[in-house]
Interface confidence: low
């Protein structure tokens, strides 16, 4: 019994003055609580509690179920307890068969004894099966048997509490251990699609899959930078004991532009959290954006190839694509394909392959694309670089020598005089007149240049060279002169091509 210090409240005293009391079934239990400030007796066993406001607790005919802890409390909140065992050979165990254990924690098999003097209080497997080798337990006659550090492998384990009575093993009712797994990793979360592009009024629906060891994983859809509660629907499945799957589906039945944003599926358990996001973009109507992959002004040499390439974004999907030149539509020589096979792809590529281009094939090449909402186009200006061609070279009636050349870029015409029989014409002659003429062909075609010199300046036999050149190449034409007396005669001109 507790000792009393004067002036300080003391706990009540109980008669009989021992911590444990053993009585036989059918005997009387008589417990007396002595305290000037007595408040109540409390009886506890398993989940049962009873109270008594009398300072003497009397049970005339004790039963096994009267086994338990009797506590007397005074007005200062101080208490004292006695534990009573009611020995009943026919009922050695009091039992609460609910048995849940959290993985890695201890759990109590609740089978307190009615007789503390039996021996070998332990656990046994059902139907004679051995317990798992690593199962450790600590028996306590007043509480039951504590299983230490519950393992996931113990789930659905069937067991009995057991004692030896008069040389025989006596088993309690059976217990089935249900293990609640510990979270040893963050939940696994995935989303049906990483991004969505919709037009106003279309339905937005996205599903998040959450996987974990048990259904106590928490999950929610959140909108980034918003506290608004989102409407979600759940489906869930248990694939075996520790393999739980939940699908959380978020739906906006008629999406609006201001619904655009990032939506996060967040899940957490006691180990940690995980999240995955999906992006929603809602547009008021469809769109097409075209991006040229090469310069829209293209220079290509005569006889060479060029590829005109565009990338374009189209939403909804493109329905018509075409390449046009001089009001004619290409039926071949081009291809159009999606940039990726991803179902949410909106980016496409179109390529027009122009081969062995001629000087007459320069011009505007146009790509047109349309979907159900919009049309779009882009034009490429193609210039074909051609070596100069001398169209005419004549001696005019006024004594002028005239050379007309065509090519692209615009040719330059230089004049040279070669006296006598010299092969190389190096003395340059300044032209009297140079004009760029309008070509009768299409724009982007060859440019025509006319240059003239005065032949009266030549006093000796020789050759006059008209040389036309540009970045691509050069071409020459020659005028031969011979003097008979005082008369100058033109011998037929001829051309010499110089690449």
């Amino acid at each position: 019994q507790p000792s009393v210090s004067p002036g300080e409240p003391s706990p009540p005293s109980i008669h009989p003055g021992k911590s444990d009391l053993i009585v036989r079934v059918g005997d009387e239990i008589r417990l007396l609580c002595t305290d000037p400030g007595f408040v109540k007796w409390t009886f506890e066993i398993l989940d049962e509690t009873n109270e008594n406001k009398q300072n003497e607790w009397i049970t005339e005919k004790a039963e096994a179920t009267n086994t338990g802890k009797y506590t007397c409390t005074n007005k200062h909140g101080l208490s004292n307890s006695i534990y009573v065992f009611v020995r009943d050979p026919a009922k050695l165990f009091l039992v609460d068969r609910s048995l849940y254990g959290k993985e890695d924690n201890d759990t109590l098999v609740r089978c307190p004894l009615t007789d503390p003097e039996v021996t070998n209080y332990s656990l046994k497997g059902c139907q004679g099966k051995p317990l798992p080798k690593d199962l450790r337990f600590i028996p306590d006659p007043k509480a039951g048997i504590m299983i230490k550090s519950v393992k996931r492998a113990y789930h659905r384990l069937c067991l009995h509490c057991s004692v030896d009575q008069e040389g025989k093993s006596v088993l309690s009712e059976k217990f089935i251990l249900k293990v609640r797994p510990a979270f040893k990793a963050v939940p696994v979360v995935s989303v049906s699609k990483a991004s969505y592009l919709l037009r106003e009024g279309e339905e937005f629906t996205v599903t998040c899959t959450i996987k974990d060891v048990s259904s106590s994983v928490y999950s929610t859809w959140k909108r980034e930078n918003s506290q608004t509660k989102l409407q979600e629907k759940y489906n869930s499945w248990h694939h075996g004991d520790f393999n739980y799957e939940r699908q959380a589906t978020l739906t906006i039945s008629s999406a609006r532009v201001n619904d655009s944003g990032v939506f996060m599926c967040y899940a957490n358990n006691t180990f940690g959290s995980a999240n995955v996001t999906t992006t929603l973009e809602v547009v008021d109507k469809g769109f097409i954006n075209i991006f040229p992959m090469i310069n829209t002004t293209v220079f290509v040499n005569d006889g060479e190839n060029v590829d005109l390439i565009v990338e374009y974004e189209a939403f909804p999907k493109p329905e018509h694509q075409q390449w046009i030149y001089m009001n004619r539509t290409f039926t071949d020589k081009w291809e159009d394909y999606p940039k990726s096979e991803n179902e949410s792809n909106i980016r496409y590529v179109s390529e027009l392959h122009l081969t062995r281009l001629k000087g007459t094939e320069g011009g505007t090449y146009t790509f047109l694309v349309s979907n159900s909402d919009v049309n779009a186009a882009i034009a490429f200006n193609v210039y074909v670089n051609t070596k100069p061609e001398i169209l005419t070279y004549d001696r005019l009636v006024n004594g002028m020598l005239q050379c007309v050349a065509a090519g692209f870029p615009e040719p330059t015409i230089d004049w040279y005089f070669c006296p006598g029989t010299e092969q190389r014409c190096s003395a340059s002659v300044l032209p009297v007149d140079v004009q760029t003429l309008n070509s009768s062909g299409p724009p982007f075609g060859k440019l025509v240049v006319q240059s003239s010199i005065d032949s009266s300046a030549f006093k000796h036999n020789g050759t006059v060279e008209c040389k036309a050149y540009n970045d691509v190449g050069k071409t020459s034409a020659y005028f031969n002169f011979a003097f008979k007396g005082n008369n100058k005669e033109q011998i037929h001109p001829h051309t010499l091509f110089t690449p």
């Epitope: 890695d104 924690n105 550090s149 510990a182 040893k184 963050v186 957490n268 006691t270 180990f271 940690g272 959290s273």
Partner: antibody, heavy 122, light 106 residues
Framework: EVQLVESGGGLVQPGGSLRLSCAAS????????MAWVRQAPGKGLEWVAN????????YYLDSVKGRFTISRDNAKNSLYLQMNSLRAEDTAVYYC???????????????WGQGTTVTVSS | DIQMTQSPSSLSASVGDRVTITCRAS??????LNWYQQKPGKAPKLLIY???RLQSGVPSRFSGSGSGTDFTLTISSLQPEDFATYYC????????FGGGTKVEIK
Amino acid sequence: EVQLVESGGGLVQPGGSLRLSCAASGFAFSGYYMAWVRQAPGKGLEWVANINYPGSSTYYLDSVKGRFTISRDNAKNSLYLQMNSLRAEDTAVYYCARGDYYGTTYWYFDVWGQGTTVTVSS
Amino acid sequence: DIQMTQSPSSLSASVGDRVTITCRASQSISSYLNWYQQKPGKAPKLLIYYTSRLQSGVPSRFSGSGSGTDFTLTISSLQPEDFATYYCQQGRRLWSFGGGTKVEIK
């Protein structure tokens, strides 16, 4: 009673090695993150390293990376810190600490050992 | 890395005083801040976690507040056993401690 007891400290020359141990009792050691935190003489606390419950992930203070290795043996309820290439600035009391969590992957140290002293001096 | 700065580094106070210690993070750490108490020759002891949650067994005169980068530990009425050094610690990215605040008897 939940308890952490460190051992293995001592005097070592610069460039030398030491292995610290921490024995855990009174709790399910295999279910907790564990850490080493040190305190140089007259200075504040400095987190050194930690390890997740199965031992598959480790994190280190930049200045000890490549020199220190944290490990654990769940069967023996033990945490270790292997310290190589020791420097004078590693002189400190080394505490073993248990990491507990609140909510998500946010940790605090709720149980500490009494510490073991490491002195690096020539 | 996230740096933690505590102020003041030391203060003198009397029993019964209200004491406030501040801790500033070099970048936002949400509410991921803990406070520890350490007495000479002893291991640190967790007082408060997640900015304001009192660890089991810690007297209610200790309280914490703040969020983002600025945090405060308050002792509403200083008791003789509260004279010690106090450390803040962030748990947002890896782990780092403040330099400590020593609370001495005036």
